[in-house]
Interface confidence: low
């Protein structure tokens, strides 16, 4: 049967009908509704929003909508003992204190439950000592400090600017350097775009604005107390001392007004070069400690936050498939926010809401997708991707057998310049084909396709006439699906111009100023970029759920595997003598990639030519496509990261947000020249090459003719 017959479809019930039903005005209305009060994970307000979304998804026409709850470790400031940082004089008197909260934006002064800025999961403590400025607190920044400048951070409080890498990596690096506390701040060089006013007059960060965020190093574990298993009523919970990924030193975030007061007194070594200097009128001295006149003054942190097991709620909606109800296409994004969530997450949640409404409209008219679509509103993403991870842990056996694809739907915008897509190579062709059919919302591209404006503004570094698609890293709810379970995944949003806007994230990220008005006044007044993102996300889900043959192209995986093999080989070749000494060869990996390429090519030919009307054959070919991503999973996981199991991709060990290719080999090679035992270190490189080789070859064989 054709897909039309199979899904009881009339000619009007096609992708075009679905896309035409999506309306910018609805997304705007939903965003406004979702952003009037804070929806912090674990609070009553966020539970009420979950129930509202459940009710509305039912009204929209989904077959079922359930709340699933888990009891996970969350972290909150102490309501009676505020967190702050002081400068103290030799008598121990506090001569300066940082702000206790962000000045609320106009119109929100009387909103209760605005959580003050804090670093979630910071332990309690009141360390005091000299300050050391550590730039972005990246691995390379600590190398510069410790190896080149001979500055010891042991026993010191470090101050690091936000940006470039995930904040949890900064804290981990500081801990390893022996710091007793970490102060994170937003430097105007990274969070204040030149020529733009501060909120509420523009989209820049004011001096009192502060970025909240968790500082965990979970490596995909989910709830810190129940790694690997759902945090349900019968779960065994670890003690807090054995919890996964918790920081061991106090951490607190501040804005640049307060940072100025701390940094202006810094003495000690000068900054090594201009890449260590931000935009404040301070010397950016590294320290340790304050300069001459102030040398007896110290910095003291006062952190009183508490971690507590708290109930969270996901909303899971189901639209049952007509032909393959046991094949799941998942669209998920989180609902919890730090404060109002004007961009993160509600610009994404509003888009999901409109996608559900459009699918529901088609369903009410008698249509069903070929495969089951699951819609998810995740809780506690901001506290470590907890809602999505616990649900996936609870349903892992179903997901690994039935999961076709996961499309993520956090913030729809981080700018309004062009499209940004990160996805598995299996989805490249789907994304290219879809964006060729969609209209560009960009000025100057009226009547042109989204593909065309995207390619012009964000060209591929490798292939002329094609747009850039990036690797999946982490820091969002696709992590468990892709990195742990091996379900093909993708994400799309509108982004900034990375050439001209060098700041990290958008300036008001995770601050109280991330409001509905920020979006409506400055980012997307017509909600046309939101609509485009809805069309991309929704269109991907539609195709994945409704195409007779899954819209995956395994040949694109072959291309990237060759690119990644070349890249890791070139990194290793920086050590030619050691490679010779320890007999390190990449020949086997290149051979496996060649085999994969040939088998993928033959599979694609068979896919093109087989009888699509034969349901057994169709299911067999689709299963080979569905399970290809799964074939890259190593059940043993990566070294010291058991929940990162994908051999081709993992979040970078130095920046959770970034994706790394052949991560096992990459990590084995990283800083190998400093290893105490080179024989053991190069032995580990060889072991990782063999694992990668086996995995690529095994994945190739899943595409071979079945008999």
């Amino acid at each position: 049967k054709s897909s039309s017959e199979a899904t009881n479809i009339t000619p009007k019930h096609n992708m075009k009908a679905f896309l035409d039903e999506l309306k910018a005005e609805n997304i705007k209305k939903f965003l406004h509704n979702f952003t009037q009060i804070p929806h912090l994970a674990g609070t009553e307000q966020n539970f009420q929003l979950a129930k509202q979304i459940q009710s509305q998804w039912k009204e929209f026409g989904l077959d079922s909508v359930e709340l699933t709850h888990y009891d996970v470790l969350l972290s909150y400031p102490n309501k009676t003992h505020p967190n702050y940082i002081s400068i103290i004089n030799e008598d121990g008197n506090e001569i300066f204190n940082t702000s206790l909260f962000e000045p609320p934006p106009a119109g929100y002064e009387n909103v209760s439950d605005i959580v003050p800025p804090f670093s979630a999961f910071s332990p309690q403590g009141m360390p005091e000592g000299d300050l050391v400025y550590v730039n972005y607190a990246r691995t390379e920044d600590f190398f510069k400090l410790e190896r080149d400048m001979k500055i010891n951070c042991s026993g010191k409080i470090v101050i690091a600017r936000y940006g470039k890498v995930f904040r949890g990596n900064k804290v981990k690096n500081a801990q390893l350097a022996g710091a007793t506390g970490v102060i994170l701040y937003s430097d105007p060089a990274d969070y204040f775009a030149p020529g733009v006013k501060s909120y509420p007059d523009g989209w820049n960060l004011p001096g009192g604005g502060v970025q909240r965020g968790n500082i965990l190093n979970l490596n995909g574990a989910g709830d810190p107390l129940t790694p690997g298993y759902p945090a349900n009523e019968y779960a065994y919970r670890r003690g807090i001392a054995e919890a996964v990924g918790l920081p061991s030193i106090p951490v607190h975030p501040i804005g640049y007004y307060d940072a100025q007061k701390l940094l202006e007194k810094m003495g000690g070594s000068a900054s090594p070069d201009s890449s260590w200097r931000g935009s404040l009128k301070v010397p950016y001295n590294v320290g340790p400690g304050f300069t001459g006149n102030f040398s007896t003054q110290k910095v003291k942190m006062h952190i009183h936050s508490t971690s507590e097991v708290t109930r969270i709620y996901n909303v899971i909606g189901t639209l049952r498939g007509a032909v393959e109800p046991d094949r799941y296409v998942i669209l998920g994004g989180h609902r919890d926010s730090w404060v109002f969530g004007g961009i993160d997450p509600q610009s994404g949640a509003a888009v999901v809401h409109e996608i559900v409404r459009s699918f529901g409209t088609l369903k009410k008219e008698g249509w069903r997708p070929r495969r089951t679509i699951l819609f998810a509103s995740w809780d506690a993403e901001e506290f470590g991707l907890l809602g999505s991870t616990e649900w996936a842990e609870e349903n892992s056996r179903l997901l690994q057998e039935r999961g076709v694809a996961y499309i993520n739907a956090d913030s729809s915008i981080e700018g309004n310049y062009t499209l940004r897509v990160d996805c598995t190579p299996l989805m490249y062709s789907l994304v290219y084909n879809l964006t060729k059919e969609l209209e560009s919302p960009d000025e100057g591209f009226e009547g042109k396709s989204l593909y065309e404006s995207w390619t012009k503004k964000s060209p591929s570094p490798e292939f002329s006439g094609m747009p850039r698609i990036s690797k999946l890293g982490s820091g969002n709810d696709f992590e468990v699906f892709f990195q742990r379970l091996g379900i093909a995944s993708g994400r799309a949003r509108y982004t900034k111009n990375w050439e001209t806007n060098k700041f990290s994230s958008y300036p008001l990220y995770h601050s109280v100023y991330e409001t509905y008005e920020l979006v409506e006044k400055f980012y997307d007044p017509m909600f046309k970029y939101h609509l485009t993102v809805a069309q991309v996300r929704g269109g991907m889900v539609f195709e994945l759920a409704n195409s007779v043959v899954l819209p995956f192209d395994c040949r694109d995986y072959a291309v990237v595997l060759r690119k990644y093999a070349d890249k890791i080989y070139n990194i290793s070749m920086k050590h030619p003598q050691e490679m010779k000494t320890y007999s390190v060869s990449f020949d086997s990996l290149f051979s496996a990639v060649k085999n994969f390429t040939e088998i993928a090519s033959k599979f694609s030919e068979r896919l093109r030519d087989f009888d699509k009307s034969n349901p057994i054959l169709l299911r067999m070919m689709n299963d080979q496509l569905m399970f290809l991503e799964r074939a890259f999973i190593d059940p043993l996981g990566l070294p010291d990261r058991p929940f990162y199991r994908h051999v081709i991709y993992a979040p970078s060990s130095h920046n959770k947000y970034a994706g790394e290719s052949f991560p096992g080999i990459y990590d084995a090679l990283f800083d190998i020249e400093s290893k105490v035992d080179p024989s053991q270190a190069w032995g580990e490189v060889k072991r990782q090459i063999s694992i990668a080789t086996f995995t690529v070859q095994a994945a190739a064989e899943t595409l071979s003719e079945v008999a």
Epitope: K79, Y84, S86, E94, N97, S112, I114
Partner: nanobody, 116 residues
Framework: QVQLVESGGGVVQPGRSLRLSCAAS????????MHWVRQAPGKGLEWVAI????????YYTDSVKGRFTISRDNSKNTLYLQMNSLRVEDTAVYYC?????????WGQGTTVTVSS
């Protein structure tokens, strides 16, 4: 039960001073940070000042910095707001509020009118 009672408001000329008090009862006063908040006629609420549970940390909105001083006497369960160099735009109902986030208990307010 938990109660906050403000006093000390009145009519005063620009440039003069007033001292507001807030008597707290029904809870352990020295465990809680406290706020002063104001509402000008026809306007929304505006944070004025905040003080930590032990009085060591204070924070002021920009428009009152250098003119207003928040303080507390934990032995008397009382919060104060010393207002100097008053301006016409300081005219408002002033409320004290318990707790930092959220402010879960409010007083009934005391009116300050600054007029020549």
């Amino acid at each position: 039960q938990v109660q906050l009672v403000e006093s000390g408001g009145g009519v005063v000329q620009p440039g003069r001073s007033l001292r507001l008090s807030c008597a707290a009862s029904g809870f352990t006063f020295n465990n809680y940070g406290m706020h002063w908040v104001r509402q000008a006629p026809g306007k929304g609420l505006e944070w004025v000042a905040i003080i930590s549970y032990d009085g060591n940390t204070k924070y002021y909105t920009d428009s009152v910095k250098g003119r207003f001083t928040i303080s507390r006497d934990n032995s008397k369960n009382t919060l104060y707001l010393q207002m100097n160099s008053l301006r016409v735009e300081d005219t408002a109902v002033y409320y004290c509020a318990k707790g930092l986030w959220p402010s879960d208990v409010w007083g009934q307010g005391t009116t300050v009118t600054v007029s020549s």
